[in-house]
Amino acid sequence: SQVSQNCHNGSYEISVLMMGNSAFAEPLKNLEDAVNEGLEIVRGRLQNAGLNVTVNATFMYSDGLIHNSGDCRSSTCEGLDLLRKISNAQRMGCVLIGPSCTYSTFQMYLDTELSYPMISAGSFGLSCDYKETLTRLMSPARKLMYFLVNFWKTNDLPFKTYSWSTSYVYKNGTETEDCFWYLNALEASVSYFSHELGFKVVLRQDKEFQDILMDHNRKSNVIIMCGGPEFLYKLKGDRAVAEDIVIILVDLFNDQYFEDNVTAPDYMKNVLVLTLSPGNSLLNSSFSRNLSPTKRDFALAYLNGILLFGHMLKIFLENGENITTPKFAHAFRNLTFEGYDGPVTLDDWGDVDSTMVLLYTSVDTKKYKVLLTYDTHVNKTYPVDMSPTFTWKNSKLPNDITGRGPQ
Amino acid sequence: SQVSQNCHNGSYEISVLMMGNSAFAEPLKNLEDAVNEGLEIVRGRLQNAGLNVTVNATFMYSDGLIHNSGDCRSSTCEGLDLLRKISNAQRMGCVLIGPSCTYSTFQMYLDTELSYPMISAGSFGLSCDYKETLTRLMSPARKLMYFLVNFWKTNDLPFKTYSWSTSYVYKNGTETEDCFWYLNALEASVSYFSHELGFKVVLRQDKEFQDILMDHNRKSNVIIMCGGPEFLYKLKGDRAVAEDIVIILVDLFNDQYFEDNVTAPDYMKNVLVLTLSPGNSLLNSSFSRNLSPTKRDFALAYLNGILLFGHMLKIFLENGENITTPKFAHAFRNLTFEGYDGPVTLDDWGDVDSTMVLLYTSVDTKKYKVLLTYDTHVNKTYPVDMSPTFTWKNSKLPNDITGRGPQ
């Protein structure tokens, strides 16, 4: 049922759900700092626009009475719990900075009629797609899936002359929250990825993965996995790998590949890394000093969530429109706003668009080099290195099925 | 975290979660009546055993602030919500009469360390199997699955001389809660049923089901569905059905088939109905006057939950044992107690055992007749009618694959 909102008469409140369970193991204090930094910027922007209003955040903490704290696997009801707490206290703001856990967000939409805008730094799963009042500020699984299908089909680049239609997916259940949902989406039999591929098998055991690397009877040369180089090394070690194996390592929220002094270890030579185009603005930010690269993206998403609210608030106030309406709740999509780190584009469903970057290891320099970029907004690939110094034969990506000629 | 229990010094309380979302659309007032009737019996039994103690129930109602009320699909967090309410009020009893919805029960075990015994009239799904402190008093999906595998393999009865290894499953998403989880279990690729079958396809559209009935290229003659005769008629109507089609209609909680004046409609001739051996004790009960046959089972499970608690309380008190211990929480299994309707047996995992009955329509009398019974406790089938007057050729169930001879 509807709760009155602290969201009128020049006073606008943001309800921030501070969950014990989170997509990334980030101290809540850091997220508070990110929100507060965002608030400072929003207040400045509103004042700059001649809007003399008050914008504050209320941090709603779980009491820990019921929920096992930790990762997202036991988070399903925590968001609803906090929503009930807000409802009981009649402290609903204009917007919810909601759970980052897919289970939790999905449950909030399943169990309630959410007529408030909700902004999430996470909620990666396909089950959170197409929610009319949900905005997601970290690349959701659907975006990854569309890249992979696009890349698999590509056959007109100097370094990729074969369409692919097969894949192995390595998924052992120990993944981080982002990886868990990315791989879930690839595994789902009804997903776009599965629909477009002719063959796809999920490898769940380390041994299955290790065996495939040299198996002459393998059904695909391509293996998708998710995590960092260390994760791959733990699994692959220094094992020999057949020359036409391609490992796609999804590691979106890690910009270490772009640091100057980084050398790619030898075991990365058969690997293409998919990551996001790097940002650097948080390096000197007051709240980001102790953040790892991944957590930088997480904290940045919280900060950008505040800036997005400020952007929408400014537009509605300038147009003399009411904030506590369905129109406001449904407006957080199909737009570009100024994030902390530059413009942020949201698609028609409120999901962040970004530039994904596919990296390879140069056999000459042992450095990570950009092979191509992909714009999720237009679902288009842009080749960058037309003559990559690959490990693969003829500096071309192999066919996905050994012994199959050009199609 | 643990909450102090109202469960000592001669005063023993039962916490009954009265959910807005429920497995069966049963007025909560009727469930209260069932609980109160059970309490009267328990008090009498304890007094009769010379145990002068107080036993009461506290009914914990959802406030409806957050949750969409209705069926179980939006119930996931309601149980946890009530548990939080109990925790905050420090009103935990010795035992929880818990949610009937699978999602809700599963979530309570996922998100918390439940060290209280929980008794459920429902929680049918496989995800609630093997919970160490959960007792389920209505046949869970695992029991159905074991019957089906047993029956499929059977090939030594006069009326079933073929082992089956294939099936269609009709599942269109509009099922009642019990059916939803029964069919989910059959659909699950990792379930015992799927593991034991060579071919299984889920039909999700009415048209798919209707087409199979006369499709010469069908891969199986057997179709499992869940619901009552009316549900089947709405789907099948008076369409012609190939002579070797067998429809298995799962309708466990419906004893109308056993009423004297019931005639089987013509469209049921190709159908075997799986139901539970009927009870009649509730017909004259004060709380059951307005109950439909299905709801009789639901209310009875609540009543039996109270009797089960009384049974365990009596044993522990007579042995001088503490009630607020893990031993008590884990004791509600591998036992038989006196239910309202006769002895009730719980298996090693706290799930109710029962006698399932497979009915066919006699082509002579147009009556439902018992073909066989199945004891879930020993996983054994007992033929009843050795010369059934079937619609099928030679009064034998056909092979599951047309044209395949004896195996």
Partner: antibody
Framework: QVQLQQWGAGLLKPSETLSLTCAVF????????WSWIRQPPGKGLEWIGE???????NDNPSLKSRVTISVDTSKNQFALKLSSVTAADTAVYYC?????????????WGQGTLVTVSS | EIVMTQSPATLSVSPGERATLSCRAS??????LAWYQQKPGQAPRLLIY???TRATGIPARFSGSGSGTEFTLTIGSLQSEDFAVYYC?????????FGQGTNVEIK
């Protein structure tokens, strides 16, 4: 105290490319958009375009096809190139900092560079 | 683009008097409007933003008002250092646009 110091060629022939650079001293570079604004002699101010530390730009459509604004974060510098200049491009060119990120008004200005286009 | 029109082009005022400068936008800019002062040979200086908020270090005699399309800059009591050209600028949308300026001269 933030200071903007700009330099570049002051005299150009028609069809040449104007090239100016602005260096930022004493303040954060990443938290702002950095603009170029020009003022023809005896006339008003015209906004040319802006860039942030990530290289995201917004340009004035009236000049867009000829304008390139770039950034070098390692040096805290940004630059303007205006191709195919004509006499109409004669102006004092200012670099300026927005008062805050995306604020759109300018609280710190360079000293200005007079660029004359003459054959 | 949004066209900004200032009036009058020139305003002659005696020291100590009040000066009122007008700025009109071709479409609503809400309150996304700034005023600048420019003296000969110098870069412009930000006076007002948000239509009415004084920038850091700007004396109280400068005040701004208005919203939507009509804006006013008022200089309460003109000092000798206030004689200059004043520009309004909108920043509601891109491209940022300036008025053509009002020259405040000594009467």
């Amino acid at each position: 105290q933030v200071q903007l110091q700009q330099w570049g060629a002051g005299l150009l022939k028609p069809s040449e490319t104007l090239s100016l650079t602005c260096a930022v001293f004493g303040g954060s570079f990443s938290g702002y958009y950095w603009s170029w604004i020009r003022q023809p002699p005896g006339k008003g101010l015209e906004w040319i375009g802006e860039i942030n530390h990530r290289g995201n730009t917004n340009d004035n459509p009236s000049l867009k096809s000829r304008v390139t604004i770039s950034v070098d974060t390692s040096k805290n510098q940004f630059a303007l190139k205006l191709s195919s200049v004509t006499a109409a491009d004669t102006a004092v060119y200012y670099c300026a900092r927005e008062r805050g990120y995306t604020y759109g008004n300018f609280d710190h200005w360079g000293q200005g560079t007079l660029v004359t286009v003459s054959s | 683009e949004i066209v900004m029109t200032q009036s009058p082009a020139t305003l002659s005022v005696s020291p100590g008097e009040r000066a009122t400068l007008s700025c009109r936008a071709s479409q609503s800019v809400s309150r996304n409007l700034a005023w600048y002062q420019q003296k000969p040979g110098q870069a412009p200086r930000l006076l007002i933003y948000g239509a009415s908020t004084r920038a850091t270090g700007i004396p109280a005699r400068f005040s701004g008002s208005g919203s939507g399309t009509e804006f006013t800059l008022t200089i309460g009591s003109l000092q000798s250092e206030d004689f200059a050209v004043y520009y309004c600028q909108q920043y509601k949308t891109w491209p940022r646009t300036f008025g053509q300026g009002t020259n405040v001269e000594i009467k």
